[in-house]
């Protein structure tokens, strides 16, 4: 039975050119994280962390995504390309998969609303 | 075009060691992490490790931690694989092999090189 | 580690035929699985990652699918050029571990 819940940053705005760190975290569950996938708004992978094997990044954007903390993922040299939906993928055990949500604004603005709590100012 | 060109074959004595060289081209070498696979004669490939070589960061199979060291050389494109303690049972080819787009399977490999080990 | 089987271990087969290739795995590995071609003094060619996807200029005779821990590789029509051994791969976790490997050879 899958008891665990997902917590995310939920809708989060940042500065275009800026960064912002994408976070979920797995609670109210004992299951171990065995694998975290990253994948953007068209279900294209960013990146994969793997408790064993540690993080593969998408080649594409290995320049501008980079690992952490913790599972999360922080991205940069923000663009407005890059608003959009975010997907965190819990693989558990022996829970089983497990699926969050974050939705990215970029901004054009100098003065972007700071809205995440895990945004990097 | 990707390219994995890998050194020539070694003949070493038990005990002693072996570093075998992977030069890429044809693709951002920063940008793929590099995995080392080894295949004994008749016998099934053999994971050993992979590196990333943006960061130097890397990953070993625990059957050959104590005894395998994968590097880079980002100037040159090149990883390498160093195997120490060498015994009979390393007779192999060693493969070095990039890693996919989409996780840690690997998309392609270089030609192998022969080491093989004998008193 | 996460134990790899295949089946059969060797197959014959003709021209035309339609082939399938199993590969069990002893833990669920959800869908990271890859399949390998090996001719002999060659090095592995990728075909299929993540299970069920085609790696770039493989052929559409070849096809996977699968999840879990029971996975399947098959070759539609049989060519010429496809007699050579299999593996399959996981790609979840540390070591990363082969299957022993198919042989398709010409009956």
């Known amino acids: 039975m899958m008891t665990g819940t997902i917590e995310t940053t939920g809708n989060i705005s940042a500065k275009k050119g800026g960064s912002v760190i994408l976070q979920c975290h797995l609670s109210s569950t004992m299951a171990q994280v065995t694998q975290v996938n990253w994948e953007q708004h068209d279900h294209s992978l960013l990146a994969i962390r793997n408790a064993e094997l540690g993080w593969h990044i998408y080649p594409a954007f290995k320049d501008r995504v980079a690992p952490g903390p913790g599972l999360g993922l922080t991205l940069q040299s923000l663009t407005m390309n890059d608003t959009g939906e975010y997907f965190c993928t819990y693989h558990t055990y022996p829970d089983g998969t497990y699926r969050g949500r974050i939705f990215l604004e970029v901004l054009e603005s100098s003065v972007a609303e700071h809205s995440a709590r895990f945004q990097i100012p | 075009e990707v390219q994995l060109v890998q050194s020539g074959a070694e003949v070493k004595k038990p005990g002693a060691s072996v570093k075998v060289s992977c030069k890429a081209s044809?693709?951002?070498?920063?940008?793929?992490?590099m995995h080392w696979v080894r295949q004994a004669p008749g016998q099934r490939l053999e994971w050993m490790g992979r590196?990333?070589?943006?960061?130097?960061?890397?990953k070993y199979n625990e059957k050959f931690k104590s005894r395998v060291t994968i590097t880079v050389d980002k100037l040159s494109s090149t990883a390498y694989m160093e195997l120490s303690s060498l015994r009979s049972e390393d007779t192999a080819v060693y493969y070095c092999?990039?890693?996919?787009?989409?996780?840690?399977?690997?998309?392609?490999w270089g030609q192998g090189t022969t080491v093989t080990v004998s008193s | 580690d996460i134990q790899m089987t295949q089946s059969p271990s060797s197959l014959s087969a003709s021209v035309g035929d339609r082939v399938t290739i199993t590969c069990r795995v002893s833990?669920?590995?959800?869908?990271?699985l890859a399949w390998y071609q090996q001719k002999p003094g060659k090095s592995p060619k990728l075909l299929v990652y993540?299970?069920?996807t085609l790696a770039e200029g493989v052929p559409s005779r070849f096809s996977g699918s699968g999840s879990g821990t029971d996975f399947t590789l098959t070759i539609s029509s049989l060519q010429p050029e496809d007699f050579a051994t299999y593996y399959c791969?996981?790609?979840?976790?540390?070591?990363?571990?082969f299957g022993p490997g198919t042989k398709v050879d010409i009956k």
């Open positions: 092999a990039r890693e996919g787009h989409y996780g840690f399977y690997s998309d392609y």
């Open positions: 044809g693709y951002t070498f920063t940008n793929y992490y």
């Open positions: 590196i990333d070589p943006d960061s130097g960061g890397s």
């Open positions: 833990e669920n590995i959800y869908s990271y």
């Open positions: 993540n299970a069920k």
């Open positions: 791969q996981h790609h979840y976790g540390n070591p990363l571990t």
